[in-house]
Interface confidence: low
């Protein structure tokens, strides 16, 4: 019979013959022959392979470097890589999360619209009319201006997006 030119799923072609791939979590030790099956071995302690493969070496688990602000989110197994995330107050610079940067603070005049997470930065929004923020903060929202009327006071100085209104006593009418 003609030697196969294409192999079934989870097989590979070598020396004109189809050999079984190694399953996830195992590496190739020797190809199959006419008389023997593919020989595979489990990956070591800090190694993994996440696909059916013919790799002769397993990949090293990712190292979550604390010097880069990283910590382990999920420990790797023989079939999965370690997943890193950032320490509190930091977020990943990329989807692969290879390093972290400090969460952005919203400047005065801006408030937090969405709190930062391990993978996304703070989202700021300008304080609308009637609201202000006088601090640079990674989690404070815009605060509403003080209502002078409810305190039986009048506005002495208008508020801005960065400052609250200043209230003062009402002028008494002189007789």
């Amino acid at each position: 019979p003609e030697p196969p030119t294409a192999c079934r799923e989870k097989q590979y072609l070598i020396n004109s013959q189809c050999c079984s791939l190694c399953q996830p979590g195992q590496k190739l030790v020797s190809d199959c022959t006419e008389f023997t099956e593919t020989e595979c071995l489990p990956c070591g302690e800090s190694e993994f392979l996440d696909t059916w493969n013919r790799e002769t070496h397993c990949h090293q688990h990712k190292y979550c470097d604390p010097n880069l602000g990283l910590r382990v989110q999920q420990k790797g197994t023989s079939e999965t890589d370690t997943i890193c995330t950032c320490e509190e107050g930091w977020h990943c610079t990329s989807e692969a999360c290879e390093s972290c940067v400090l969460h952005r603070s919203c400047s005065p005049g801006f408030g937090v619209k969405q709190i930062a997470t391990g993978v996304s930065d703070t989202i700021c929004e300008p304080c609308p009319v009637g609201f202000f923020s006088n601090v640079s903060s990674a989690f404070e929202k815009c605060h509403p201006w003080t209502s002078c009327e409810t305190k039986d006071l009048v506005v002495q100085q208008a508020g801005t997006n960065k400052t609250d209104v200043v209230c003062g006593p009402q002028d008494r009418l002189r007789a």
């Epitope: 989110q73 995330t85 950032c86 509190e88 107050g89 937090v112 619209k113 969405q114 709190i115 997470t117 391990g118 996304s120 601090v135 903060s137 990674a138 989690f139 404070e140 929202k141």
Partner: antibody
Framework: QVHLQQSGAELVRPGTSVKVSCKAS????????IEWVKQRPGQGLEWIGV????????NYNEKFNDKATLTADKSSSTAYMQLSSLTSDDSAVYFC??????????WGQGTLVTVSA | DIVMTQSQKFMSTSVGDRVSVTCKAS??????VTWYQQKPGQSPKALIY???YRYSGVPDRFTGSGSGTDFTLTISNVQSEDLADYFC?????????FGAGTKLELK
Amino acid sequence: QVHLQQSGAELVRPGTSVKVSCKASGYAFTNYLIEWVKQRPGQGLEWIGVINPGSGGTNYNEKFNDKATLTADKSSSTAYMQLSSLTSDDSAVYFCARLDGGAAASWGQGTLVTVSA
Amino acid sequence: DIVMTQSQKFMSTSVGDRVSVTCKASQNVGTYVTWYQQKPGQSPKALIYSASYRYSGVPDRFTGSGSGTDFTLTISNVQSEDLADYFCQQYNSYPLTFGAGTKLELK
């Protein structure tokens, strides 16, 4: 070992205030946010707000803007929540919890506040 | 505010069963969801964070799944100690919000 120790139960009169404390140990107090959560008897959990003990910055659930004031004392690694103008609706168990990236993995044991004449 | 809806207030189960507690967010929260277990007279205990990651020490019969707006906590091979209230919480944006809770009870 992270531990949050809350102050004991309080029986208070309507219209008064109460201050609940949450003493943290086993970690760097200023490195994690502390949140406060309300639970009325037999009810669900209600988020009050959060404080950054390092900066004193806060974020409140608008519902509690005029009810709760969150503060923190770095020197004693203690977070506080003051509840003012108390009514029977404020009778509840109040929890403090440490936020780890947004999720509360460590909780205090809870403080029961009972408002009664 | 983001509303987290746990449509089933009570769920009946038997020891050894598999049960799924669901939670629906009123808007996309990515995977920023935590599941908590609470037993009477105790503080809530975090089981799952980022929708699907188990906290250390949590038995592997607890599994979280979902993203966007639909989330599920599955307990396979329910044990008597799993009878408790289960709450979901989103931490995608302020104010953080909880579901109303689902009480798991024996049939």
